[in-house]
Interface confidence: low
């Protein structure tokens, strides 16, 4: 039984254009296009254009939706953890004790054992078990950089709490660096936040693995709960696959517009407000690349005889293991427009208007 | 012409279960389930369980996918901007000049005029035109909190540059606060980052609107380019709709599992690895709530006679203005598993395994 159908591309485009007509009006909560009777002639006021451009700049600077996940993210990640070097290690003696900081060091040989190649690392988190905290505390995390210099990484505002709680800092980039370099021991510093005005801040928060006096002796609480790095990485044997065969392409404009892909892909569609919708009321832009998703996402029967070949198709055609996978937008971007209500120009941002990439979902 | 079909729910579930069988193996790059011959008897080692639990904690703490957008996010946002109060205003005299900070004040009456209700604000960005910068500079943004105290908001590492560049800070929460409070004038402070050790930092970066001496005189560069707040908000007249009729429900487990929704919704499906897949090789968890998406997403012809009624349907049934909208997962969560390869226990994280909500796309 064949369920193949010839796709009428023109009908699909027409339906997409008509859908956009309704979408724009619906987003603006307009039952019909606004009257243009009072619109002043001539170009848009400079201030309005400046505002429109500010909005466009924002769009250019930051895509509204997360980037499509790279192929590696589809595959399982092996999880390991590396505990902080015990605090009686001599490395801790090199760093002067202070009321505003605690230090945490890690053995890079242990890290390399868990993740042999920097490229395999998908995520690294520094996990700290925070004990009681009487007052709100603003803390900063630093990375040991060279001999005695520290590079700022991130900060956190900790709310007061009577119960212990795990804190997690994303340190993927730092650990990737450490895996690439030759150092034997690397570390972090957790400090109170000091502003240029107030510099007498004390680190009030108690981290399990350090005595309250911060002398560096291990606390008596279970050593497994001392600070550790939680690592998620692609196992080495699985990595060879990734390099040798890039089954999963990003179904984005770069790939789809320049290929003859028959399966799910983003298809080019420029909408000219005047020509396609018969609208003169949108003053900027004159049109936009709306695009659309089209193409089959075959359901894969995993009981197929050619099993290993079939499994390789999952990543592309049915990564979400849907019962009826469908070609839908993945990355979308907003569209700013300028139009008039009476004599008043308005700049509005319409969310999720431009299809940048598609996926089988 | 009716294209209605009776959905065979059991077949859909079976296809979803079979797809998951292939998906898990595919994510682990296994052609078949691993042999269990060498697996040691007895419970899992404590360290492995601790690691598995750490991974589960991470999942609980942060959903892998962004939250489904609230209804308000579908609708257009009016964009306005409010320029910083000119620096000859007396407010600037109240704050002592320093080498490490510049101050930016805003008239809240102007903010309220642009956004009459705090709930209408969708996004607020502080935009600063950064001029030349000779060295890397780590800056911090603070919010004026009470009389003369400042609350830390965020930080940025600025790379050296010869050309001007707009900097953008998300200050939505702060502006929402200001709109709720009675203050007449509110402000930000941009400061050099000072650590508790090194406190002699100078703000090297030049922001348009301030002389290099930071005396507070407006620079000669076009005043429109002085710091401003870019605001995106739901216009008041559009907001009444939102409160009165919540057309767009989150199609998530809370709603869908407790309703008889016929259209696109997330449907309950628990997969027991032993019973449903005949697998004994996954040691933790014993099963999981995979769920799936099902239900029609009607295409809406926007040329319909009942035009205003039709437009209200867009938000729910075809927000992306697709030519053939489809019910697909929106929020997904990962699944950590424990299994053995030979005698070695492995903890792995599988991305996008649990369907939390669906959408028409």
């Amino acid at each position: 039984l064949s369920t193949c159908k010839t796709i009428d591309m023109e009908l699909v485009k027409r339906k997409r254009i008509e859908a956009i007509r309704g979408q724009i009006l619906s987003k603006l909560r307009l039952a019909s296009p606004p009257s243009q009777g009072e619109v002043p002639p001539g170009p848009l006021p400079e201030a309005v254009l400046a505002l429109y451009n500010s909005t466009r700049d924002r769009v250019a600077g930051e895509s509204a939706e997360p980037e499509p996940e790279p192929e590696a993210d589809y595959y399982a990640k092996e999880v390991t953890r590396v505990l902080m070097v015990e605090t009686h290690n001599e490395i801790y003696d090199k760093f002067k004790q202070s009321t505003h900081s605690i230090y945490m060091f890690f053995n890079t040989s242990e890290l390399r054992e868990a993740v042999p190649e920097p490229v395999l690392l998908s995520r690294a988190e520094l996990r700290l078990l925070r004990l009681k905290l009487k007052v709100e505390q603003h803390v900063e995390l630093y990375q040991k950089y060279s001999n005695n210099s520290w590079r700022y990484l991130s900060n956190r505002l900790l709310a007061p709490s009577d119960s212990p709680e795990w804190l997690s800092f994303d340190v993927t980039g730092v650990v990737r660096q450490w895996l690439s370099r030759g150092g034997e021991i690397e570390g972090f510093r957790l400090s109170a936040h000091c502003s240029c005005d107030s510099r007498d801040n004390t680190l009030q928060v108690d981290i399990n693995g350090f005595t309250t006096g911060r002398r560096g002796d291990l606390a008596t609480i279970h050593g497994m709960n001392r600070p550790f790095l939680l690592l998620m990485a692609t196992p080495l044997e699985r990595a060879q696959h990734l390099q040798s065969s890039r089954h999963r392409r990003a179904l984005d404009t770069n790939y789809c517009f320049s290929s003859t892909e028959k399966n799910c892909c983003v298809r080019q569609l420029y909408i000219d407000f005047r020509k396609d919708l018969g609208w003169k009321w949108i003053h900027e832009p004159k049109g936009y690349h709306a695009n659309f998703c089209l193409g089959p996402c075959p359901y894969i029967w995993s009981l197929d005889t050619q099993y290993s070949k079939v499994l390789a198709l999952y990543n592309q055609h049915n990564p979400g293991a849907s019962a009826a996978p469908c070609c839908v937008p993945q990355a979308l971007e907003p569209l700013p427009i300028v139009y008039y209500v009476g004599r008043k120009p308005k700049v509005e941002q319409l969310s999720n208007m431009i299809v940048r990439s598609c996926k089988c979902s | 012409l009716s294209t209605c079909k009776t959905i065979d729910m059991e077949l859909v579930k079976r296809k979803r279960i079979e797809a998951i069988r292939g998906q898990i193996l595919s994510k682990l790059r296994l052609a078949s389930p691993p042999s269990q011959g060498e697996v040691p008897p007895g419970p899992l080692p404590e360290a492995v369980l601790a690691l598995y639990n750490s991974t589960r904690d991470r999942v609980a703490g942060e959903s892998a996918e962004p939250e489904p957008e609230p209804e308000a996010d579908y609708y257009a946002k009016e964009v306005t901007r409010v320029l910083m109060v000119e620096t000859h205003n007396e407010i600037y005299d109240k704050f002592k000049q320093s080498t490490h900070s510049i101050y930016m004040f805003f008239n809240t009456s102007e903010l309220r005029e642009a956004v009459p209700e705090p709930v209408l604000l969708s996004r607020a960005e502080l935009r600063l035109l950064r001029l030349k910068l000779k060295v890397e500079q780590h800056v911090e943004l603070y919010q004026k909190y009470s009389n003369n105290s400042w609350r830390y908001l965020s930080n940025r590492l600025l790379a050296p540059s010869d050309s001007p560049e707009w900097l953008s800070f998300d200050v939505t929460g702060v502006v929402r606060q200001w709109l709720s409070r009675g203050g007449e004038i509110e402000g930000f402070r941009l400061s050099a980052h000072c650590s508790c050790d090194s406190r002699d930092n100078t703000l090297q970066v030049d922001i348009n609107g301030f002389t290099t001496g930071r005396r507070g005189d407006l620079a000669t560069i076009h005043g429109m380019n002085r710091p401003f707040l870019l605001l995106m908000a739901t216009p008041l007249e559009r907001a009444q709709h939102l409160q009165s009729s919540r057309h767009r429900r989150a199609l998530d487990t809370n709603y869908c599992f407790s309703s008889t929704e016929k259209n696109c919704c997330v449907r309950q499906l628990y997969i027991d690895f032993r019973k449903d897949l005949g697998w004994k090789w996954i040691h933790e968890p014993k099963g999981y709530h995979a769920n799936f998406c099902l239900g029609p997403c009607p295409y809406i012809w926007s040329l319909d006679t009942q035009y205003s009624k039709v437009l209200a349907l867009y938000n729910q049934h075809n927000p992306g203005a697709s030519a053939a909208p489809c019910c697909v997962p929106q929020a997904l969560e990962p699944l950590p598993i424990v299994y053995y390869v030979g005698r070695k226990p492995k903890v792995e994280q599988l991305s996008n395994m649990i369907v939390r909500s669906c959408k028409c796309s």
Partner: antibody
């Protein structure tokens, strides 16, 4: 055709109150800011204040104690409530439609009513 | 508060003359300035906004220039219907809209 028609003027004794109205037609009243301006006989224009679409009002410093601006969008009408009137409040009172073009308060009066004369005299 | 000073307060000119009226702000108002024309017994009429943008329907013999504190309204060739009083107006600040005291253009 944009039309603004002021009413409610007349002769009033010092210390008394008066409410002026401005009926708007020919445009989408609820989405426009509106102003009141006055002109004493033989003198220049004095801005009294304006009201934004949401009902937020701003007034000149001198008008803050005694003058109140309000609007009823359902009736397409703008109001000016004047209390404790004095002889120096004698003027032609105009309502005008403001044109708010972003960024700053681009309050440009591009449509005016014909005005209504208020005479404060005992 | 900003003060707006218009000069001259009155001037006499003939049809066909080039007429210039100036307006000075007590502090910088960028280009947030409008010009109005008022004839006896009538409300004012907008001529120019944003210092130099001509309102729709206003003859091109009217032009505006300036930014910061100094502004000029120019009528390139005075016509009979141009005899009137002209006002400048600043609108740079949310709390105040200030008019100049006016310039009366009379027939010489």
């Amino acid at each position: 055709q944009v039309q603004l028609v002021e009413s409610g003027g007349g002769v009033v004794q010092p210390g008394r109150s008066l409410r002026l109205s401005c009926a708007a037609s020919g445009f989408h009243f609820s989405s426009e800011a509106m102003n009141w301006i006055r002109q004493p006989p033989g003198k220049g224009l004095e801005w009294i204040g304006y009201i934004y679409t949401s009902g937020t009002t701003y007034r000149a410093n001198w008008a803050r104690g005694r003058f109140t601006i309000s609007r009823d969008n359902s009736k397409n009408t703008l109001y000016l409530q004047m209390n404790s009137l004095r002889a120096e409040d004698t003027a032609v009172y105009y309502c005008a439609r403001g044109w708010h073009i972003f960024d700053h308060h681009y309050w440009v009066m591009h449509a005016w009513g014909q005005g209504t004369l208020v005479t404060v005299s005992s | 508060d900003i003060q707006m000073t218009q000069s001259p307060s009155s001037l006499s000119a003939s049809v066909g003359d080039r007429v210039t009226i100036t307006c000075q702000a007590s502090q910088s108002i960028s280009t947030y300035l409008a010009w109005y024309q008022q004839k006896p017994g009538q409300p004012p009429k907008l001529l120019i906004y944003a210092a130099s943008t001509l309102e729709y329907g206003v003859p091109s013999r009217f032009s505006g220039s300036g930014s910061g504190t100094d502004f000029t309204l120019t009528i390139s060739s005075l016509q009979p219907e141009d005899f009137a009083t002209y006002y400048c107006q600043s609108y740079s600040d949310g709390d105040s809209v200030i008019f100049g005291q006016g310039t009366k253009v009379e027939i010489k």
